[in-house]
């Protein structure tokens, strides 16, 4: 019993005066608390308590469940205790089988003994299975058996408290340990799509997948820069122990333009947080934006190839695409394909392949595309660069020599005179008249130039050269002159190809 200094309040005195008392089942428990300021007896077992305001605690026929700690308390709040074991060979353990352990922490298997004199108080696996090799425990007959530093691997471990009684092993009811994992990493979050494009009135639905070791992970959808509560639905699965998956689906049944913005799926646990975002763009109606990948004015040499390429954004999906030239639709020579295979792709490419273009195939090539909301078009002006072709070269009745040439770009015509039999015509002759004529062909066709000189200026035999040229090449025509007396004759005009 405790001893105190005189004058100070002292704790109550208990009879019998020992810390532990062993009684047999069916026997009487009689405990007397002596204190002038007696307040109450408290009985505690498996962390449950009962009170008694009588200073003598009497249990006429003790049962195993009367095993526990009896505490007498006085008005000063001072107390004294005695632990009573009610020995019952048929009930060696009192149990509370709720058994939860937090990873890396200790947990108590609540199986206090009713008989402190049994031996080998320990834990055993169910069905004769051994306990994990690293499982450490400390037995306490009055409280149970403390498992030290619970491991995740112990989850759903089935075990019994065990003692040896008269040489035989006696097992308690089974305990199943439920381990709550410690969070040792942030949750893993992912989103079904990184961006969404919708028309007003369409449904917006996006799913966030959250993965963690337990369902205790917190998650929510948030609108950036907004406190508005969002409507979410959940599905969740346990893919085995400590592999939990939740799908949080955010839905806006009829999206509006002002719903556009960034939505964040946020998840956190005691270790930390993670988030992922998706962007919603809501448009009042669909659109098509076309971007030419080459200049819309195209110059190409005769006989060469050219690809007319556009990229375009179309939302909703494009329904009709076509390339048109001179009111005729191309049925082949073109291809149209999405820029990427991404589910949210709205960008497409269309290519028209023009091969071995002729001078007559210049003109406006138009790409048209439409979806359910809008139409759009883009035109390419294609100019075919052609070497000049001399269409006519004549001596007119008025004595003029006339040369007409066609080509693109517009040819320049120069005149030269070669006296006698010289091959090189170097002396240039100034034209009397130069005109650009309207071509009877399609626009973007060859440009026709007419140039004239006065033949009366030539006094000697020789050759007159009409030379038409542009960036692509040159062509010449020749007039041969011979004088018979005073008469000048054009012997045969002819052309020479000059590469």
């Amino acid at each position: 019993q405790p001893s105190v200094s005189p004058g100070e309040p002292s704790p109550p005195s208990i009879h019998p005066g020992k810390s532990d008392l062993i009684v047999r089942v069916g026997d009487e428990i009689r405990l007397l608390c002596t204190d002038p300021g007696f307040v109450k007896w408290t009985f505690e077992i498996l962390d449950e308590t009962n009170e008694n305001k009588q200073n003598e605690w009497i249990t006429e026929k003790a049962e195993a469940t009367n095993t526990g700690k009896y505490t007498c308390t006085n008005k000063h709040g001072l107390s004294n205790s005695i632990y009573v074991f009610v020995r019952d060979p048929a009930k060696l353990f009192l149990v509370d089988r709720s058994l939860y352990g937090k990873e890396d922490n200790d947990t108590l298997v609540r199986c206090p003994l009713t008989d402190p004199e049994v031996t080998n108080y320990s834990l055993k696996g169910c069905q004769g299975k051994p306990l994990p090799k690293d499982l450490r425990f400390i037995p306490d007959p009055k409280a149970g058996i403390m498992i030290k530093s619970v491991k995740r691997a112990y989850h759903r471990l089935c075990l019994h408290c065990s003692v040896d009684q008269e040489g035989k092993s006696v097992l308690s009811e089974k305990f199943i340990l439920k381990v709550r994992p410690a969070f040792k990493a942030v949750p893993v979050v992912s989103v079904s799509k990184a961006s969404y494009l919708l028309r007003e009135g369409e449904e917006f639905t996006v799913t966030c997948t959250i993965k963690d070791v337990s369902s205790s992970v917190y998650s929510t959808w948030k609108r950036e820069n907004s406190q508005t509560k969002l409507q979410e639905k959940y599905n969740s699965w346990h893919h085995g122990d400590f592999n939990y998956e939740r799908q949080a689906t955010l839905t806006i049944s009829s999206a509006r333009v002002n719903d556009s913005g960034v939505f964040m799926c946020y998840a956190n646990n005691t270790f930390g947080s993670a988030n992922v975002t998706t962007t919603l763009e809501v448009v009042d109606k669909g659109f098509i934006n076309i971007f030419p990948m080459i200049n819309t004015t195209v110059f190409v040499n005769d006989g060469e190839n050219v690809d007319l390429i556009v990229e375009y954004e179309a939302f909703p999906k494009p329904e009709h695409q076509q390339w048109i030239y001179m009111n005729r639709t191309f049925t082949d020579k073109w291809e149209d394909y999405p820029k990427s295979e991404n589910e949210s792709n709205i960008r497409y490419v269309s290519e028209l392949h023009l091969t071995r273009l002729k001078g007559t195939e210049g003109g406006t090539y138009t790409f048209l595309v439409s979806n359910s909301d809008v139409n759009a078009a883009i035109a390419f002006n294609v100019y075919v660069n052609t070497k000049p072709e001399i269409l006519t070269y004549d001596r007119l009745v008025n004595g003029m020599l006339q040369c007409v040439a066609a080509g693109f770009p517009e040819p320049t015509i120069d005149w030269y005179f070669c006296p006698g039999t010289e091959q090189r015509c170097s002396a240039s002759v100034l034209p009397v008249d130069v005109q650009t004529l309207n071509s009877s062909g399609p626009p973007f066709g060859k440009l026709v130039v007419q140039s004239s000189i006065d033949s009366s200026a030539f006094k000697h035999n020789g050759t007159v050269e009409c030379k038409a040229y542009n960036d692509v090449g040159k062509t010449s025509a020749y007039f041969n002159f011979a004088f018979k007396g005073n008469n000048k004759e054009q012997i045969h005009p002819h052309t020479l190809f000059t590469p």
Epitope: D47, T49, Y100, K102, N105, I176, R180
Partner: antibody, heavy 117, light 111 residues
Framework: QVQLVQSGAEVKKPGASVKVSCKAS????????MHWVRQAPGQGLEWMGV????????SYNQKFKGRVTMTTDTSTSTAYMELRSLTSDDTAVYYC??????????WGQGTLVTVSA | EIVLTQSPSSLSASVGDRVTITCRAS??????????MHWYQQKPGKAPKLLIY???NLESGVPSRFSGSGSGTDFTLTISSLQPEDFATYYC?????????FGQGTKLEIK
């Protein structure tokens, strides 16, 4: 003997919060898990979550996601359940229940929370 | 989550009748051969009261006319001879894994 005594009925407006208390006696408060269960009028029982003994870890039914917080005050042996952003769907009787020997052996008397504009 | 489906949803019976209520789980609630399935009785305006724990164990103080059976996914609560005080709503509940779930309830009414 074990007793769980809950706070009285509450009437709240939509968007408000409510904090229900559950005072425990007759056992060592810190040794047992405390669960919260609710029951909407004419409906079944719905588990909201648990605050575990010891470190006071919690585990919530994801249905209540960031809206629910369970706490304890060990000095008064009282458990609390706070529910935020209330809507009319949260009108229900809220119960605390002590887990003993793997089952809900003791229940509070219930607290009616009415959410009404 | 584990979904519990009770049948029937409601039942009319007379005093003295034998009544059986079933509860089916969407997946097994057993661990090491032990079923984490419990049965509760609830009367109007009152908190639920535990009747049967771990599928077949009678809670202390509950009359022996109540019994439970089953394992895995299929469970039964039986009242061998209905008494007037037994007219109430009965719920099954699993605590094998979180979130813990209840059946939707079976309302037992006087015929």
């Amino acid at each position: 003997q074990v007793q769980l005594v809950q706070s009285g009925a509450e009437v709240k407006k939509p968007g408000a919060s409510v904090k229900v208390s559950c005072k425990a006696s007759g056992y060592t408060f810190t040794s047992y898990n405390m669960h919260w269960v609710r029951q909407a009028p004419g409906q079944g029982l719905e588990w909201m979550g648990v605050i575990y003994s010891g470190q006071g870890d919690t585990s919530y039914n994801q249905k209540f996601k960031g809206r629910v917080t369970m706490t304890t005050d060990t000095s008064t042996s009282t458990a609390y359940m706070e529910l935020r952003s209330l809507t009319s769907d949260d009108t229900a009787v809220y119960y605390c229940a002590r887990e003993r020997d793997t089952r809900f052996g003791n229940w509070g008397q219930g607290t009616l929370v009415t959410v009404s504009a | 989550e584990i979904v519990l489906t009770q049948s029937p949803s409601s039942l009319s019976a007379s005093v003295g009748d034998r009544v059986t209520i079933t509860c089916r789980a969407s997946e097994s609630v057993d661990i090491y051969g032990e079923s984490f399935m419990h049965w509760y009785q609830q009367k109007p305006g009152k908190a639920p009261k535990l009747l049967i724990y771990h599928a077949s164990n009678l809670e202390s103080g509950v009359p022996s006319r109540f019994s439970g059976s089953g394992s895995g996914t299929d469970f039964t609560l039986t009242i061998s001879s209905l008494q007037p005080e037994d007219f109430a709503t009965y719920y099954c509940q699993q605590n094998r894994e979180e979130p813990y779930t209840f059946g939707q309830g079976t309302k037992l009414e006087i015929k």
